[in-house]
């Protein structure tokens, strides 16, 4: 019962997380104009991964897509890639986990197969969550770098007379959505991996039973028979689980400092 609950909760949490990752990726407010300590402008600038927008005081909002691939900063491309990989992995993970759910019966699928699928989806959710968190963090780092760069030369004087105000950008709502969604997907994945352990059929440790035949005392241990047949699948599951743990550790960590053009 607890296993089913853990698996179900893991699925729901991951589903919410992936929906959040998709939402964050599509959102326009990855970076928003910093209004603090700036002249009050009659326009509000904000940017997403796919387009930049300007909302005027008049009520009009104009958005322009980035209709170039080569002209975009490498970091933006990297963030896009991370988010898309996260979405794809998450979507596959969701598909796999639907069939892995204990409450759903598909033909004569064994518990061991469901355990494997649960683990696979769990790992996919973990990697998906890490991709989203990494993508959002790379973008956030890029913003912080740019913010301090533009603060350093915020007012560029022209002959000491005319001033040009540089628009500074700060964290947009999409970053927080992305972080939370990535975290939820990660948590959901961990829950699926935990549920996998409970789903795998455990070795039945029967106590030795003595059968008293007339004049003879024979001890019968069925464990030996079980080991000699192909039913001892728990060992195999353990192997996959360990491999899964290794895969989690192999997820690349990204450098914290990036150049943004």
């Amino acid at each position: 019962m607890a296993v089913t609950a853990c698996q179900g909760l893991g699925f729901v949490v991951s589903l919410i997380g992936i929906a959040g990752i998709i939402a964050a990726t599509c959102m326009d407010q990855w970076s928003t104009q910093d209004l603090y300590n700036n002249p009050v402008t009659a326009v509000f600038n904000y940017q997403g991964l796919w387009r930049s927008c300007v909302r005027e005081s008049s009520g009009f909002t104009e958005c322009r897509g980035y209709f170039t691939l080569l002209g975009l900063p490498a970091m933006l491309q990297a963030v896009r890639a991370l988010m898309i990989v996260g979405i794809v992995l998450g979507a596959i993970g969701l598909l796999v986990s639907i069939f892995a759910l204990k409450c759903i019966r598909i033909g004569s699928m064994e518990d061991s197969a469901k355990a494997n699928m649960t683990l696979t989806s769990g790992i996919m959710f973990i990697v998906s969550g890490l991709c989203a968190i990494a993508g959002v963090s790379v973008f956030a780092n890029m913003l912080v770098t740019n913010f301090w760069m533009s603060t350093a030369n915020m007012y560029t004087g022209m002959g000491g007379m005319v001033q040009t105000v540089q628009t500074r950008y700060t964290f947009g709502a999409a970053l927080f959505v992305g972080w939370v969604a990535g975290g939820l997907t990660l948590i959901g994945g961990v829950m699926m991996c935990i549920a996998c352990r409970g789903l795998a059929p455990e070795e039945t440790n029967y106590k030795a039973v003595s059968y008293h035949a007339s004049g003879h005392s024979v001890a019968y241990k069925p464990g030996g028979f079980k080991a000699s047949t192909g039913f001892g699948s728990n060992t195999k599951n353990k192997k996959i689980y360990d491999g899964g743990a290794r895969t989690e550790d192999e997820v690349q960590s990204y450098p914290s400092k990036h150049d943004y053009v």
Epitope: V43, V54, E56, S58, G59, T164
Partner: antibody, heavy 118, light 113 residues
């Protein structure tokens, strides 16, 4: 056809109060930012106050901050300007304007005259 | 506050003549978000409210004759009337539409010779 009609102007003593109204028609009022602009006799226009479509953002000129209050009633398609502690320098023709592209004052009313005199 | 400086304060012209008037702002009116200059030109005739001519420094409002052309970027802007007509005699104002307060220039008065 966009139509803006101001009302509520008149003669008022210094220190007095007045409430101007602007009835809008011919467009979806709740979708546009609105403003009040005044013009003293023989002078150029002077922006007074701005209110966003949802009344979330409100800005005033330094000369009227704390004395004037801009508000809107989207259900009634009406813009207001409540003026208090009036001074002689507030004497002007007050125009109601609807913002357009580029935050420009795309449409103007015919104005209502406010005279502050003892 | 942004200071808008218009020059000349008045212009005496003859019909059919080409006219240019200048507007300078104390701060750049170029918005980096969309690379547009938030400067507007208005025309005001006696007894009438100002009429919008050009927004975004160079975009003509619908219904405005194409003899009116706006140009410039950053802090220096120009309004050009390619061939002045009698009905163009008015006061022309430029306005900063990027920073609050939304300041107007003092105006350029166009008069007939």
């Amino acid at each position: 056809e966009v139509k803006l009609v101001e009302s509520g102007g008149g003669l008022v003593q210094p220190g007095g109060s007045l409430k101007l109204s602007c009835a809008a028609s011919g467009f979806t009022f709740s979708r546009y930012g609105m403003a009040w602009v005044r013009q003293a006799p023989g002078k150029g226009p002077e922006w007074v106050a701005f209110i966003s479509n949802s009344a979330y953002s409100i800005y005033y000129a330094d000369t009227v901050t704390g004395r004037f209050t801009i508000s809107r009633e989207n259900a009634k398609n009406t813009l207001y300007l409540e003026m208090s502690s009036l001074r002689s320098e507030d004497t002007a023709m007050y125009y109601c304007a609807r913002l357009g592209y580029g935050n420009s004052f795309a449409y103007w009313g015919q104005g209502t005259l406010v005279t502050v005199s003892a | 506050d942004i200071v808008m400086t218009q020059s000349p304060s008045s212009l005496t012209v003859t019909a059919g003549e080409k006219v240019t008037m200048s507007c300078k702002s104390s701060q750049s009116l170029l918005n980096s978000g969309n690379q547009k200059n938030y400067l507007t030109w208005y025309q005001q005739k006696p007894g009438q409210p100002p009429k919008l001519l050009i927004y975004w420094a160079s975009t003509r409002e619908s219904g405005v004759p194409d003899r009116f052309t706006g140009s410039g970027s950053g802090t220096d802007f120009t309004l050009t009337i390619s061939s002045v007509q009698a009905e163009d005699l008015a006061v022309y104002y430029c306005q900063n539409e990027l920073f609050y307060p939304l300041t107007f220039g003092a105006g350029t008065k166009l008069e007939l010779k």
